[in-house]
Interface confidence: low
């Protein structure tokens, strides 16, 4: 028998430095957990302890914090080198900057393999990108080989900006040849490393023969085996077991996100290459690990260059930017105007003819809204003025809801108005008018939402059992401020861009913004 | 509802250790921090430590940090406080609380226990 | 350690007539936009109760007339329409870094 140790990491979202337990910004440094720091030391200790260790990443090191908005995926690169990673599987975000955002800092700066085997490039990419991701890579561990073998996300072109001249082809179909290649090659242990989500890997885990282990990424689930060490809730024992189509059981593994946990499985395999056994758990990298004084070093030295960024002039207003809590939580605010603007400005996908874009719609509680803009500073907004506005460092993400969900949502949205309390809801793409007289759950009068298959953008009733896409952020997609209706009935959920960052681009992108109070939320009494 | 529970009034001598127990109901338990303060008679309030009872974390205020030791037991959703080597000076009413922190890490105490008088 | 100053001692103040109560701090309790300060309000025999959490938000079921202010290093709780239920302690408290610690109290008397 031979004994593999598999470390793994996914959707760390450019947490390089530690956090706090909620993976926001580290405040009281004794709680705060995660960073490549501390990652380094476990990772270290781990290597030192035993023989045949690989450190893996299933995808997202791209997009979260000021890191990546600064550094661009240099600090990835850098970051990963730097802690020997042996191999990354392609997540969608890594496109958010475009193919070229991908080539130039991460691609050619990575001294480990970038894989995926269901990207395919065509036309004048293809001979650009050539060699510098690959569908599988061969490593030595100790004295055997193992086979690394990726996988992307097909709904990237949704989701990123992977440009035309890349085909996201069906994981499943794409993977087979190439894991049959690899038996070929007489390599017997292979592993499947990707970022498609759980739902996915446990697919691929059943359907593509020769897989040996599936570590993922992408739905940012937490596996654990015993009780769970901090907040966050199993999704089912680590790893998870997949029966095969063939009879096998293959083992599942993810890491949560955020660089909050190490994933932590040994697998044992035969001399023909079958899995005997897996065990494991994720290890909570907590404060009681120390940080490596040399990577904390080198984090702050590269540290300095965010402060400065952080006070830099990304755009001007000319209006007051009203994001106080007396406006933002009891009627339409020109501050939650301007973040659903940036938030649909953000997804504009032109992916389908049929359609002028694949989402119209925003949503965005007003108690997410933490500080207004005043424009007599010159009109001067920084990333700090942004900041203070969005200060919780969560994400804008795209759902899937039915008509009938939303039509909760914006009933809740109302319920006990007046008592200045978080869920009042800004909106766009939508026209929503309220009839306070009526009772609670009784009160949205119309509603009205901004078509997407057409070529001219009008606002048309909702219908309850028509599916729509919405962009909003992950607190309201894990059913903050009391939307339980999102979470449970939500089809699709999608992590999407830092919040701080979609605005600041936007911004940057408008150069002088003007927002308005429009008309989008209006209250009536009486009848329709 | 969330409610926190705690033990009863103790009268303690100098020397001894005192146990105060808290309770808690109508919430996850082990995702969120209990931390302790203390009252004396006509005094302020004053922060002893805290526990996530999830993974047993503990911090406590240097003041206390060699007296006082904070526990949870997660099966009956109770934490503990104990703190040794009793003086007058200990004389207080010891509250539990629960911080909140959803949205964000804010550590503000959103639900208290009775408060438990413990008297030396 | 944060040391938090609070002021006046005690306010007396006849109902209808706005309260404002000051909590300064030796040390910056402000990041990432956020202010790490709240207060709380406590009646004789009785536990302290949240009224305002990171500085301006009003904890659910406090009524509105509690309001909170301020950023960095100095707070000013308001109570504005002052009513006689109102007659109680009043402490601030930050949660910036360990160890958390409490302002000494302002009593508001209602005349």
């Known amino acids: 028998a031979w004994e593999l140790t598999i470390l793994h990491t996914n959707d760390v979202h450019s947490r390089l430095e530690q956090t706090s337990e909620d993976s926001s910004k580290c405040v009281n440094a004794s709680r705060c957990m995660g960073g490549v720091a501390r990652l380094f030391t476990k990772v270290q200790q781990i290597r030192r302890a035993e023989p045949n260790v690989l450190l893996l990443d299933a995808g997202d090191q791209y997009q979260g914090t000021i890191w990546f908005t600064v550094y661009k995926g240099a600090e990835v690169a850098h970051f990963m080198n730097a802690l020997r990673y042996d191999a990354m599987a392609l997540g969608n975000h890594e496109f958010d900057n475009g193919v070229e955002g991908l080539i130039e800092p991460l691609l050619k700066e990575a001294k480990f393999p970038i894989l995926s085997a269901n990207i395919k490039a065509k036309g004048p990419l293809a001979s650009q990108i050539s060699g510098l991701y690959l569908p599988y890579k061969v490593l030595p561990v100790g004295d055997e080989v193992v086979g690394i073998v990726g996988y992307t996300s097909k709904e990237t072109p949704f989701l990123s900006n992977p440009g035309t001249n890349l085909v996201f082809e069906d994981e499943i179909t794409a993977l087979q040849p190439e894991v049959d290649k690899l038996k070929t090659l007489n390599v017997n242990k292979i592993i499947a490393l990707g970022h498609s989500g759980f739902e996915m890997d446990k697919l691929i885990a059943q359907k593509v023969r020769g897989v040996d282990v599936v570590v993922g990424g992408h739905s940012n689930t937490f596996l654990y085996t015993g009780n769970p060490p901090s907040k966050e809730v199993p999704a089912g024992k680590y790893p998870f077991i997949v029966t095969s189509d063939d009879g096998r059981k293959v083992p599942v593994v993810q890491a949560y996100a955020f660089g909050k946990y190490l994933g932590y499985l040994k697998i044992e395999f035969d001399e023909r290459g079958n899995v005997i056994s897996s065990h494991g758990n994720p290890i909570l990298l907590n404060s009681s690990i120390p940080e490596d004084p040399s990577i904390k070093a080198d984090i702050n030295k590269w540290r300095i260059k965010l402060d400065n960024y952080s006070t830099q002039e990304l755009g001007k207003t000319i209006v007051y930017l009203d994001g106080s809590s007396q406006s933002c939580r009891f009627r339409e605010c020109n501050m939650g105007n301007l973040i659903c603007d940036a938030m649909i400005n953000n997804n504009l996908r032109h992916t389908d003819e049929m359609f002028w874009n694949h989402v119209s719609m925003c949503i965005l509680n007003g108690g997410g809204i933490r500080s207004p803009i005043d424009e007599r500073n010159n009109g001067t907004i920084t990333w700090e003025n942004l900041a203070a506005v969005l200060p919780f460092g969560g994400t804008f993400d795209l759902v899937q809801l039915k008509g009938s969900t939303l039509k909760k949502a914006f009933e809740h949205s109302v319920h006990r108005y007046g008592q200045s309390t978080g869920e009042f809801l800004q909106v766009g793409g939508i026209h929503v008018v309220y009839d306070l007289s009526r009772k609670p759950g009784d009160r949205v009068v119309k509603l009205d939402v901004l078509c997407t298959k057409c070529r001219v953008p009008s606002y048309d009733p909702l219908k309850m059992d028509e599916v729509y896409k919405v962009i909003l952020p992950n607190f309201l997609a894990n059913g903050g401020d009391g939307f339980q209706m999102i979470k449970d009935e939500l089809l699709r959920h999608d992590s999407g861009d830092q919040d701080i960052n979609v605005v600041s681009t936007y911004i940057s992108k408008m150069k002088v913004i003007y927002p308005a109070v429009e008309g989008r939320i209006k209250f009536s009494t009486g009848s329709h | 509802q969330v409610q926190l529970v705690q033990s009863g009034a103790e009268v303690e001598k100098p020397g001894a250790s005192v146990k105060v127990s808290c309770k808690a109901s109508?919430?996850?338990?082990?995702?969120?921090?209990i931390t302790w303060v203390r009252q004396a008679p006509g005094q302020g309030l004053e922060w002893m430590g805290d526990i996530y009872p999830g993974s047993g974390n503990t911090n406590y205020n240097e003041k206390f940090k060699t007296r006082v030791t904070i526990t949870a037991d997660k099966s009956t959703s109770t934490a503990y406080m104990e703190l040794s080597s009793l003086r007058s000076e200990d004389t207080a009413v010891y509250y539990c609380a629960k911080e909140g922190g959803l949205t964000t890490e804010d550590y503000a105490l959103d639900y208290w226990g009775q408060g438990t008088l413990v008297t030396v | 350690e944060i040391v938090l100053t609070q002021s006046p001692a005690t306010l007396s103040l006849s109902p209808g007539e706005r309260a404002t109560l000051s909590c300064r701090a030796s040390?910056?309790?402000?990041?990432?936009?956020?202010?790490?300060m709240h207060w709380y309000q406590q009646k004789p025999g009785q536990a302290p109760r949240l009224l305002i959490y990171l500085a301006s938000n009003l904890e659910s079921g406090i009524p509105p007339r509690f309001s909170g202010s301020g950023y960095g290093t100095d707070f000013t709780l308001t109570i504005n329409n002052i009513e006689s239920e109102d007659a109680a302690y009043y402490f601030c408290?930050?949660?910036?870094?360990?160890?958390?610690?409490f302002g000494q109290g302002t009593k508001v008397e209602i005349k």
């Open positions: 109508g919430y996850t338990f082990t995702s969120y921090w």
């Open positions: 040390k910056n309790v402000a990041t990432s936009g956020y202010s790490y």
């Open positions: 408290q930050h949660s910036r870094e360990l160890p958390f610690t």
